[in-house]
């Protein structure tokens, strides 16, 4: 369960892949599309509002019931729209929704290396946001093997301005 309904903190950041491609969002036919692309030099990076929530481990996962807390994030590139996992289609989509947000909008945050993170589906442990064919997709990861695989690593570059104004 998510502890409380308000985030611990929020930050405004640009999101890029391990290979420094940008994650961009485009409004097309009244819905948003998500792209993974090389940005032209002068083009500004798209911003995403990350909201951080505290969550208790599901009891099945915590070996002796003491692994209390994980960080979960929601990602919102524009007002009222959030990234969501579509587990049936193995896709990542932008949906307009109202709070309280559905579980599909929450991702467990994994700090991977100095500036890299991964996003694991709250609704499907072991499944991460990843890059496939220049799009974001859901990728099943074998914990024992591939947690460091580059296609699920993302770089967050915090934008130091007042985050509430990103919309």
């Amino acid at each position: 369960s998510i502890t409380g309904i308000s985030p611990i903190t929020e930050s405004l950041a640009s999101l890029s892949t391990y290979n420094d491609q940008s994650i961009t969002f485009a409004l097309e036919d009244e819905s948003y599309e998500i792209y993974v692309e090389d940005l032209k030099k002068d083009k500004k990076k798209d911003k995403v509002l990350l909201s951080y929530y505290e969550s208790q481990h599901p009891s099945s996962e915590s070996g002796d019931g003491v692994d209390g807390k994980m960080l979960m994030v929601t990602l919102s590139p524009t007002k009222d729209f959030w990234l969501q996992a579509n587990n049936k289609e193995h896709s990542v989509e932008l949906h307009k929704c109202e709070k309280p947000l559905p579980d599909q909008a929450f991702f467990v945050l994994h700090n991977r290396s100095f500036n890299c993170v991964s996003f694991e589906c709250k609704t499907d442990p072991g499944v991460f946001i990843g890059v496939k064919d220049n799009h974001l997709a859901l990728i099943k990861v074998d914990y024992s093997e591939n947690l460091g695989s580059e296609n699920i690593l993302f770089k967050l570059s915090e934008i130091l301005e007042h985050h509430h104004h990103h919309h």
């Epitope: 930050s11 692994d67 807390k69 994980m70 700090n111 100095f114």
Partner: antibody, heavy 122, light 107 residues
Framework: EVQLVESGGGLVQPGGSLRLSCAAS????????MTWVRQAPGKGLEWVST????????YYADSVQGRFTISRGHSKNTLYLQMNSLRAEDTAVYYC???????????????WGQGTMVTVSS | DIQMTQSPSSVSASVGDRVTITCRAS??????LAWYQQKPGKAPQLLIY???RLQSGVPSRFWGSGSGTDFTLTISSLQPEDFATYYC?????????FGPGTKVDIK
């Protein structure tokens, strides 16, 4: 109950080596990045090193880079700090610490060991 | 590296007093700041994490606030067991850094 128990401290001559251990219990060790923090006598706290839950990422303070090596043994739920080329300024109590959040280092250190004293002197 | 400064470096206070300690980061750290209490010969104890979240088991007279670069720890009514040294620490990124500490002693 979470427990962290350090051992391996002692008196060592400058240029010598020591290996510190921290035995962890009461939580799923492999899910947590683990950290060493030290405190010189009468001084403040200084972060020394952190290792990711999987063990494949390590981070060091500039003051110990190249001399200290952090590692972890998952089968024994133990954190290690191999300290080589020790200097007088490494004299301190060394604590191991567990972060608030599994899989992330953003929170804080919610559990600390009792500490083990390392004295570097001739 | 992010530098952490604390003020005051020491404060003399009486039981029942309200005590405020401030911590400043040299650059923005969002809300990734923790406060610890340490007594002589003991390990530090976590009081507040994520700038304002009270660690389980810590009395509610301790509270934290702030984000970005400026943070505050307040003890609303000082108790005899609160005389100790208090440290802030940024957990935004490596190298993690601690403030120099604030010693709270008996007036």
């Amino acid at each position: 109950e979470v427990q962290l128990v350090e051992s391996g401290g002692g008196l060592v001559q400058p240029g010598g080596s020591l290996r510190l251990s921290c035995a962890a219990s009461g939580f799923t060790f492999s899910n947590y990045a683990m950290t060493w923090v030290r405190q010189a006598p009468g001084k403040g706290l200084e972060w020394v090193s952190t290792i990711s839950g999987s063990g494949d990422n390590t981070y060091y303070a500039d003051s110990v880079q190249g001399r200290f090596t952090i590692s972890r043994g998952h089968s024994k739920n133990t954190l290690y700090l191999q300290m080589n080329s020790l200097r007088a300024e490494d004299t301190a109590v060394y604590y191991c610490a567990k972060p608030t959040y599994s899989r992330s280092w953003y929170g804080a250190f919610d559990f600390w060991g009792q500490g083990t004293m390392v004295t570097v002197s001739s | 590296d992010i530098q952490m400064t604390q003020s005051p470096s020491s404060v003399s206070a009486s039981v029942g007093d309200r005590v405020t300690i401030t911590c400043r980061a040299s650059q923005g750290i969002s809300s990734w700041l923790a406060w610890y209490q340490q007594k002589p010969g003991k390990a530090p104890q976590l009081l507040i994490y994520a700038a304002s979240r009270l660690q389980s088991g810590v009395p509610s007279r301790f509270w934290g606030s702030g984000s970005g670069t400026d943070f505050t720890l307040t003890i609303s009514s000082l108790q005899p067991e609160d005389f100790a040294t208090y440290y802030c620490q940024q957990a935004n990124n490596f190298p993690f850094t601690f403030g120099p500490g604030t010693k709270v002693d008996i007036k």
